[in-house]
């Protein structure tokens, strides 16, 4: 009103929602008697009496503040509990006598919003969108006053940018009087944004000062066309037959295009499409040398039907062919010599080794094995191993059996067997020679014969132990075109004295047989437990 003294600025009181506001009447004694005060709330320039103080006693007026007001500080302060956003207004105290004066208090109310809730576009964003696309939404609930939102990309605040970045925000008032802020970030994204981290920040004020809350960081699915296609082979490095090999087509586009893998046919000079699995991966298992060749990948954009071709990739599946040994089935006389030759093909340089089958002893490094002054013991298996030293595990082997001509050779000359009378005994006799011998027994029983290998035979005999048999023992005779040889099995009855804890028996010394064609076995001794070979 013109001519009226300008009102002083109201005192500012700041409180958080839910707390108690202390409204101190700042009238001096000269301005009025604090034991006689009226309190008003001012809303839209309308005063409403809310509290009276008379003789230091307070009395609430009926209405919205009735239950929440009380006097403190000997009547100088009005306490307003459970502050709400609707309480943000001017309160004034008016003293009575000597003259009416008033003191104004501006109540400011604050509430921190909840953590901002960010939601990313679940469908993703293509880089070629005509206008900025919705990247993410941010919701800050129940704040007061309205918080401010700032969007960040890779830690940098985003500013409005025509046709590039647009931030659209709106707020709603809840029934509580609190604000919910909603914001949506729209942007034109580029391929490099596929790894970009976006988040939103709410800035708000409390009585204690300025604060902020950040959402979690999110990445947005970004769709961009394929520009480059390439092949990857697993495992990396030298491949060999038998490996599981995966040929994978890769592209730098998102989503990945539709792939097809083809292999060049050297004879027709045409590419033939290979059958891939559901993921577009060509699996070669087991890999074979025929899988070697030139592979390439074609990527199709099913929207545009434009295709891209990868650089061709040469695949080499290393191999070692079947190993051939000559002669394949060598036969030699004792004292003679033998040359074994090993051959194989490979995609890499080969190393050859000759090993004795029975002992795995390396006899020769190289494809040729020469054996001189052959003894009967030289008969048996020789293994040629062709390997590629640069590729562990890539090797092939071939076994050859050397046969030395000779009369039968007995596994033992004599053996003592502990028996009980009337038991059925299982006896065995083994002989080797070339040609392969046959075995006969000097007693009646059930005999069965089995080949151990081409030069060796094992015969078993089931026989009943009789007093006569105990007296005579049992003989087995092995014979071939070059002679015969015999083994004797002595049968001895088990008795308590023979079954001492450490008792064991030793066969007697071998002696030569009378056959004109045989050579006596070497002398041998054999330790046996004093028990029957078999119980009937």
């Amino acid at each position: 009103v013109p001519g009226e003294a300008e009102q002083p600025a109201p005192e500012l009181v700041e409180v958080e929602v839910g707390s108690t506001a202390l409204l101190k009447c700042g009238l001096s004694q000269s301005q009025g008697n604090l034991s006689h005060v009226d309190w008003f709330s001012v809303h839209k320039e309308k005063r409403t009496l809310i509290f009276r103080v008379r003789q230091g006693q307070g009395q609430s007026e009926p209405g919205e503040y009735e239950q929440r007001l009380s006097l403190q500080d000997r009547g100088a302060t009005l306490a307003l509990t459970q502050v709400t956003p609707q309480d943000e207004r001017i309160f004034l105290c008016q003293g009575k006598r000597p003259r009416s004066q008033e003191y104004r208090i501006q109540l400011r109310v604050y509430k921190a919003p909840e953590e901002p809730n960010i939601q990313v576009n679940p469908l993703g964003i293509p880089v070629n969108s005509k206008e900025p696309e919705e990247v993410a939404t941010c919701v800050g609930r129940n704040g007061y006053p309205i918080p401010q939102v700032i969007w960040y990309k890779n830690g940098r605040p985003l500013k409005e940018e025509k046709n590039r970045v647009h931030i659209q925000s709106s707020q709603t008032v809840e029934s509580s009087g609190l604000y919910t802020l909603q914001s949506i970030l729209k942007a034109q994204l580029v391929k490099e944004d596929k790894d970009a981290q976006f988040y939103c920040e709410l800035n708000y004020r409390l009585p204690s000062g300025n604060h902020m809350k950040e959402s979690r960081e999110v990445t947005v699915p970004v769709f961009y066309p394929t520009e480059k296609v390439w092949l990857e082979v697993e495992p990396v490095g030298m491949l060999k037959e038998g490996d599981r090999v995966e040929i994978r087509c890769l592209a730098d586009g998102n989503p990945p295009p539709h792939f097809s893998i083809s292999k060049g046919n050297p004879s027709t000079r045409e590419a033939e499409e290979e059958t891939t699995n559901d993921n577009g991966v060509l699996v070669l298992e087991p890999a074979r040398k025929e899988h070697s060749g030139r592979y390439e990948c074609q990527a199709w954009n099913l929207d545009t039907m434009i295709s891209l071709l990868s650089e061709p990739q040469e695949l080499l599946v290393n191999y070692v062919s079947d190993v051939r040994v000559s002669p394949a089935a060598p036969e030699r006389q004792e004292g003679s010599s033998l040359t074994l030759t090993c051959e194989a093909e490979s995609s890499q340089d080969l190393e050859f080794q000759w090993l004795r089958e029975e002992t795995d002893q390396v006899l020769e490094r190289g494809p040729v094995l020469q054996l001189h002054d052959l003894k009967r013991e030289a008969g048996g298996g020789y293994r040629c191993v062709a390997s590629v030293p640069s590729i562990p595990g890539l090797n092939r082997t071939q076994l050859v059996k050397l046969a030395i001509f000779g009369p039968p050779w007995m596994a033992f000359k004599e053996r003592k067997v502990w028996v009980k009378e009337n038991m059925v005994l299982n006896l065995s006799c083994e002989a080797s020679g070339h040609p392969r011998p046959t075995i006969s027994w000097n007693v009646n029983g059930t005999a069965s014969e089995g080949d151990q290998d081409p030069q060796r035979v094992l015969s078993t005999l089931n026989v009943l132990v009789t007093p006569e048999l105990l007296e005579t023992g049992v003989e087995c005779t092995a014979s071939n075109d070059l002679g015969k040889n015999t083994s004797i099995l002595f049968l001895e009855l088990v008795n308590l004295t023979t079954l001492t804890p450490d008792s064991n028996t030793t066969t007697g010394l071998s002696t030569s047989t009378a056959s004109p064609h045989t050579r006596a076995n070497s002398t041998s001794t054999e330790r046996k437990l004093p028990e029957p070979e078999s119980r009937g």
């Epitope: 939601q119 679940p122 939404t137 949506i184």
Partner: antibody, heavy 118, light 106 residues
């Protein structure tokens, strides 16, 4: 107020193409995206396709090669075409509005039942 | 694709009961989840969004909770109009719905 209404044939023969139209009112297609969602009889809901407020189109990869979604902002219409229809495509087809500040559907059409049969 | 598994698939309850329906995501979806109610022959209606925010106009007896992979829709005191089928839906990566929970009168 916001409304969405689906229209199109109720019966389609196998191998034929289905064309559905969603006519909207109470909002602009340039401020809210629209999706198509279907529901076979007695079964769950299945999202099919969407068009954003900016006009970007999205498809469920299970039917991608058969679908086209487009819009005519002047007519406030969104059109879905689905080729090579099969009896398993028999369903109620709904169009739904995407909430402007979220990614859920706040308003739906009443749906149209499409039967695929010879 | 993210799978959403609801349990139970059906549920019988009485008016006044407290009812809980759960939804499990096959991977972390943070709170990108909505709940819908569908009555026979009608379109779905959104109840809850962002896992726990009540849609305007939806009675406060409906509430949502959970984050990550496990989510719950609770009806604190069933009313006759609440008997319907309820669906959860994730919007973290694409859109997928649960198979539904049919809430019937006991």
């Amino acid at each position: 107020q916001v409304t969405l209404k689906e229209s199109g044939p109720v019966l389609v023969k196998p191998t034929e193409t289905l064309t559905l139209t969603c006519t909207v009112s109470g909002f602009s297609l340039t401020s809210n995206g629209v999706s198509w969602v279907r529901q076979p009889p007695g079964k769950a809901l299945e999202w099919i396709a969407a068009i954003s407020s900016g006009g970007t189109t999205y498809y469920n990869s299970a039917f991608k090669s058969r679908l086209t979604i487009s819009r005519d902002t002047s007519k406030s219409q969104v059109v879905l075409t689905m080729t090579n229809m099969d009896p398993v495509d028999t369903a109620t087809y709904y169009c739904a509005r995407r909430y402007g500040y979220g990614w859920y559907f706040d308003f739906w059409g009443q749906g149209t039942l499409v039967t695929v049969s010879s | 694709d993210i799978q959403m598994t609801q349990s139970p698939s059906s549920l019988s309850a009485s008016v006044g009961d407290r009812v809980t329906i759960t939804c499990k995501a096959s991977q972390n979806i943070y709170n990108s989840l909505a709940w819908y109610q569908q009555k026979p022959g009608k379109a779905p209606k959104v109840l809850i969004f962002n896992a726990n925010s009540l849609q305007t106009g939806v009675p406060s007896r409906f509430s949502g909770s959970g984050s990550g992979t496990d989510f719950t829709l609770t009806i604190s005191s069933l009313q006759p109009e609440d008997f319907a089928t309820y669906y959860c839906q994730q919007f973290y990566s694409g859109y997928t719905f649960g198979q539904g929970t049919k809430l019937e009168i006991k």
